[in-house]
């Protein structure tokens, strides 16, 4: 089938990095500068993506593959193939229509992107708050209040040291 197809269509012989040039009797011509073809049999080469402005070049364009972009520091990629760069915020903030805003009390964000999330409600699991939450960190839940009855301790005491020469009882 391949041989039949190549007899019918000389363009199918053109490899990636070339295009089938109708102006030159359908011979395979190399892609011009700043263009590429990632598959064989192409009748045109695609224009290389340019990583401009907030976008920076992660991988240069070649005759067989497009350029790849990522974002300059202070921004992160969004969308397929990094089609957008979104502003980073600080930990303890979220991005709103008016820019980066501090997380409201009772919420936190430990990343430079995404939204502020509510602190864990320890009591839902029957636990108590061991470490309070902040804008940047979730609360840390500890043992349940029942485990902390008078005389009980949340920290396991160390095993008593054995005296040399004594076997365990």
């Amino acid at each position: 089938f391949e041989r039949t197809r190549s007899l019918q269509d000389p363009c199918s012989n053109c490899p990636a990095g070339t295009f089938c040039d109708n102006n030159r009797n359908q011979i395979c011509s190399p892609c011009p500068p700043n263009s590429f073809s990632s598959a064989g049999g192409q009748r045109t080469c695609d224009i290389c993506r340019q990583c401009k402005g907030v976008f920076r070049t992660r991988k240069e364009c070649s005759s067989t593959s497009n350029a790849e972009c990522d974002c300059t520091p202070g921004f992160h990629c969004l969308g397929a193939g990094c089609s957008m760069c979104e502003q980073d915020c600080k930990q303890g903030q979220e991005l709103t229509k008016k820019g980066c805003k501090d997380c409201c009390f009772g919420t936190f964000n430990d990343q430079k992107r995404g939204i502020c999330r509510p602190w864990t409600n320890c009591s839902l699991d029957g636990k108590s708050v061991l470490v309070n939450g902040t804008k940047e960190r979730d609360v840390v839940c500890g043992p349940s209040p029942a485990d902390l009855s008078p005389g009980a301790s949340s920290v396991t005491p160390p095993a008593p040291a054995r005296e040399p020469g004594h076997s365990p009882q």
Epitope: R49, S83, C85, Q87, K98, G99
Partner: nanobody
Amino acid sequence: QVQLQESGGALVQPGGSLRLSCAASGFTFDDYAIGWFRQAPGKEREGVLCISSSGGSTYYADSVKGRFTISRDNAKNTVYLQMTNLKPEDTAVYLCGAPRDCSRYSSDDYWGQGTQVTVSS
């Protein structure tokens, strides 16, 4: 066609001031934010300041707070970056871009070519 043209770059002494302009043409200027970025020799490009279509400012770089301000004149399709108390570390090529929103840039946004600012005694 769409164009963004920066101007106003110069050699200035430390402590001096400069006003850069970003003049736009070929698109509905009022609908777009304008962001300023800079690239110093051998360093990563960094965001400086942005002004939204409604006139609100977003600082990308903490190092310019209190020294740089941004404004826009929609009648002249121009955004201005006013830079005061300039430091040698402000030396860079400054370029402007036109996103829809200061917090999000798209790969098909418009960009200028840049203007050189050199701070040196």
